[in-house]
Interface confidence: low
């Protein structure tokens, strides 16, 4: 960025100036003018381009084409495009003329030294624009956008360290550098110029809190060579020219986008003239590079699974075995959190959300640790944070959280187009209350964080009718082999009553729910006839259906869904303390591993040797090429108001779509 530098020439002695390649310098010839001057001529040595700009209306002209009428509105513009080999090796000569004199009245000479300076992010951002054609002070979204990308260096590459990599001002291991973005300062010009000029790398104190910079000052394979030069308390750094014409810096993010932080960070290099001992150094030129901190991105259940997490607790051996078998079928890794670490807190879905951050050079999985802080609260930090697995959390200052702050209440849709707008990374779905009402909501700090990521704009659904209050209690997504690529599953009391009425008409009214449940206390069976004659249950489920229908309309509108994109899964709810819980295991609360679904075993009415609820679900999902495995979670999960999805978590493959190519 030019500071619109103006150089004043003198008749008494030649003037020297430094100019930057490609940057215009204005030459002021009006400071000392011989008496009687009516015209002037301007010439430059080869490599110096000189233009005259008569006024705003008329474009600039090359100066060496003719003699110019002396007029204080004229601007003389000098540009050099390649760096000098030596100090003052180019010059501009101005001659002042009168119509009465054949020879020039006087000469002024301006000696020029050209230096080329650029500060760039290492633009291996696939397809992002070449720096010569863009305003580097901007960061632009989209396939033809430009600007650098920074990762929050929130993993722990050195297992011997206690903290995340960006928590101090050191590079502890070389692997750490892979999580950083490269920034290059290139300078070309006579070395002698830097005897009385200096280069300063600088940023604002605001940005210094959000990113930090290391300068490589020694052998690349030695950690100590990476000197911390900007960030935290450091806002400027005089750059020693250690490696001739190119200095390399490594930049890491310290903070994710959040309330009050857009994610944009600027670094500047300024060339300062320090030749005059009586004055402070004066700026000649500043170049800027802008980075955007990569957002944390959630992965929908339709993306391929990489790793499944489950807790082993006192009474869930069969459940863990079933999940292990499903993971094996789906070809993904299984991690079991032992009882010593979970202390019988089995709700691993509620404790954390597994997502990722991405730059062109690196993709890093990142766990978002919920503020719920049950007995599993140490698991994400102690067991998931590690080499190439980052960690982030948000907790309200007053520590006040509700059940809605558990991450069973944080989901994301597959990619959608809604109201003409593309959401190539889907939209985050969180549960809250009806607009304008004062019930439970996700804590503000989590909502702020999710909104600030920008790439998956959140939709708030109504969940306060549920006792636990999580979106995964009535909603899930499964992959589908067609253009849409997915179906949304919604829990449906209406569909369940319809199914039971059909079975009753066919003479199966005495078929029993909950037959075969293995539990310490015998679970009471109930027949289809009893369900359909229970007025309270029917009325309550009408209310539940209206709550789900409210969400259905929101989801259709905000995700651009048609009725054919939605599958109604039969489900009944019961009331506890005026809020809803699943009457039988909640079928939509399922584990989706590619085409393999781990669905809570509903223990529905057995008709002709088959559970009619399982049969119905199979008939709805198997035509999509999905394989349904019904997992008995009744005692260890369902009785505690959760199901298969609540008790598992999945790390998934990132989107192939690159977030910087979208336009939020």
């Amino acid at each position: 960025m030019s500071l619109q530098r103006i150089v004043r020439v003198s008749l008494e002695h030649p003037t020297s100036a430094v100019c930057v390649a490609g940057v215009e310098t204005l030459v002021d010839i009006y400071g000392s003018v011989p008496e009687g001057t009516e015209m002037f001529e301007v010439y430059g040595t080869p490599g110096v381009d000189i233009y005259i700009s008569p006024n705003m209306e008329r474009g600039r002209e090359r100066a060496d084409t003719r003699r110019w009428r002396f007029d204080a509105t004229l601007e003389i513009i000098v540009v050099m495009n390649s760096p000098s080999n030596d100090l003052n090796d180019s010059h501009v000569q101005i001659s002042y003329h009168s119509s009465h004199e054949p020879l020039p009245l006087a000469y002024a000479v301006l000696y020029l030294t050209c230096v080329d300076i650029s500060l760039d992010c290492d633009l291996n951002c696939e397809g992002r624009q070449d720096r010569n054609f863009v305003d580097k002070r901007q960061w632009v979204w989209g396939p033809s956008g430009y600007g650098g990308i920074l990762l929050v260096n929130c993993d722990r590459d050195d297992p011997s360290c206690d903290v995340q990599d960006n928590c101090d001002q050191h590079v502890h291991c070389l692997q750490d550098l892979e999580d950083m973005s490269v920034m290059v300062l290139r300078t070309q010009g006579p070395a002698a110029l830097f005897d009385d000029h200096k280069l300063v790398l600088h940023t604002s104190s605001y940005d210094a809190k959000r990113a930090q910079v290391f300068h490589i000052c020694g052998p690349e394979d030695v950690c100590e060579a990476y000197r911390h030069v900007l960030g935290q308390d450091k806002v400027s750094y005089e750059v020693p020219r250690l490696h001739g014409d190119e200095e390399r810096f490594f930049v890491e993010g310290l903070s994710f986008p959040d309330a009050g932080f857009t994610g944009l960070i600027s670094f500047h290099v300024t060339l300062l003239d320090d030749s005059n001992e009586d004055f402070s150094a004066s700026p000649i030129f500043t170049d800027t590079v802008v980075f955007r901190v990569a957002p944390w991105i959630m992965t929908p259940s339709t993306l391929p699974p990489l790793e499944v997490y489950v807790c082993r607790v006192r009474n869930n051996t069969c459940f863990v075995d079933a999940v292990a078998e499903l993971a094996r079928k789906a070809g993904c890794k299984l991690t079991i959190c032992p009882q010593a670490e979970n202390r019988n807190d089995r709700w691993i879905q509620d404790e954390m959300e597994l997502g990722y951050v991405q730059a062109p050079h690196k993709t890093l999985p990142v766990v978002f640790d919920s503020p719920r802080n049950g007995e599993l609260q140490d698991f994400p930090y102690k067991r998931i944070l590690g080499p190439d697995f980052g960690y982030v959390t948000r907790e309200p200052r007053d520590r006040s959280v509700s059940g809605l702050d558990s991450f069973g209440n944080l989901e994301v849709s597959p990619p959608v187009v809604a109201n003409g707008k593309e959401y190539p990374l889907g939209r985050i779905l969180i549960g809250g209350n009806l607009p304008g009402s004062s019930g439970r909501r996700v804590t503000q700090v989590v909502r702020d964080f999710l909104h600030a990521q920008k790439v998956q704009p959140p939709v708030e659904l109504f969940v306060d009718w549920l006792a636990v209050g999580h979106v995964d209690e009535f909603l899930s997504f499964v992959p589908a082999p067609d253009g849409k690529g997915f179906r949304m599953l919604l829990a449906s009391p209406g569909a369940c009553f319809k199914l039971f009425q059909e079975k009753q008409k066919c003479g199966h009214g005495r078929a029993l729910l909950f037959q075969g449940v293995v539990d310490d206390e015998q679970v009471k069976t109930i027949s289809i006839n009893q369900v359909l004659s229970n007025k309270d249950l029917i009325n309550y489920n009408k209310f539940v259906q209206s709550c789900i229908d409210w969400n259905r309309e929101v989801l259709k509108r905000e995700l651009g869904l048609a009725e054919c994109d939605i599958i109604d899964i039969p489900q009944l709810f019961k009331t506890e303390r005026k809020k809803a819980t699943a009457f039988f295991p909640d079928l939509v609360n399922m584990l989706v591993l590619g085409k393999h679904l781990g669905i809570p075993k509903p223990f529905g009415p057995i008709i002709n040797g088959c559970c009619c609820l399982e049969e119905k679900v199979r008939s709805l999902l198997e035509p999509l090429g999905l394989h349904c495995t019904f997992i008995d979670d009744f005692t260890p999960y369902h009785m505690l108001h959760g199901e298969v999805h609540c008790g598992t978590n999945v790390c998934r493959k990132p989107f192939s779509f690159k977030w910087w190519n979208m336009v939020p």
Partner: antibody, heavy 119, light 109 residues
Framework: EVQLLESGAEVKKPGSSVKVSCKSS????????VVWVRQAPGQGPEWMGG????????HYAQKFQGRVTITADEDTSTAYMELNSLRSDDTAVYYC????????????WGQGTLVTVSS | EIVLTQSPATLSLSPGQRATLSCGAS???????LAWYQQKPGLAPRLLIY???IRATGIPDRFRGSGSGTDFTLTISGLEPEDFAVYYC??????????FGGGTKVEIK
């Protein structure tokens, strides 16, 4: 409805310990949290801590951290509260109560155990 | 921790009158996790209202809880002789820093 039966009144010397028991009947012990609340003469109730028997993990109010131990025995459906290093200002009625899992909200209360600390 | 301040300390009313008891919190009680208890001499507290406004099982509808954030109210619409007791408010939003108010005594005038 859950019934809670607490152990009998105790008189203790300063510096000693007391262990109060609370036996539950009429409901599934595992399905609730058990909380302990004390009430000094003429004062409002004071929440001491609680335990979810299913998770077997106690939670303590900061004030009592290090001095109180709350345990639960699933086999006998009994919860226990032990308070150490007793002082005269620990003289109070100690109540146990059942609570819903997801919040520590005392719902059904025991009859209370009077603990008197006096030299 | 959240401090709960109840007012007035004592309320002298006649049977049939309306009683209005206040409970102020030093900071917002999230999710309105506030309860009201009634306690008679020598007995354990009895849960009347939870989640600020939901009546517990078996509680007559003359007891009504309202409010949100930092200001909560218990209203007894027509006092019956058995309603004269001490009433405590209780917040359970910030475990394990759970607190009770100092109480309001409702006595016969």
């Amino acid at each position: 409805e859950v019934q809670l039966l607490e152990s009998g009144a105790e008189v203790k010397k300063p510096g000693s310990s007391v262990k109060v028991s609370c036996k539950s009947s009429g409901g599934t012990f595992n399905n609730y949290a058990v909380v302990w609340v004390r009430q000094a003469p003429g004062q409002g109730p004071e929440w001491m801590g609680g335990i979810i028997p299913m998770f077997d993990t106690p939670h303590y109010a900061q004030k009592f951290q290090g001095r109180v131990t709350i345990t639960a025995d699933e086999d006998t459906s009994t919860a226990y509260m032990e308070l150490n290093s007793l002082r005269s200002d620990d003289t109070a009625v100690y109540y146990c109560a059942t609570s819903y899992f997801r919040q520590w909200l005392p719902r059904d209360w025991g009859q209370g155990t009077l603990v008197t600390v006096s030299s | 921790e959240i401090v709960l301040t109840q007012s007035p300390a004592t309320l002298s009313l006649s049977p049939g009158q309306r009683a209005t008891l206040s409970c102020g919190a030093s900071q917002s009680v999230s999710s309105n996790y506030l309860a009201w208890y009634q306690q008679k001499p020598g007995l354990a507290p009895r849960l009347l209202i939870y989640d600020a406004s939901i009546r517990a099982t078996g509680i007559p509808d003359r007891f009504r809880g309202s409010g949100s954030g930092t200001d909560f109210t218990l209203t007894i619409s027509g006092l019956e002789p058995e309603d004269f007791a001490v009433y405590y408010c209780h917040q359970y939003a910030t475990a394990p820093q759970i607190t009770f108010g100092g109480g309001t005594k409702v006595e016969i005038k």
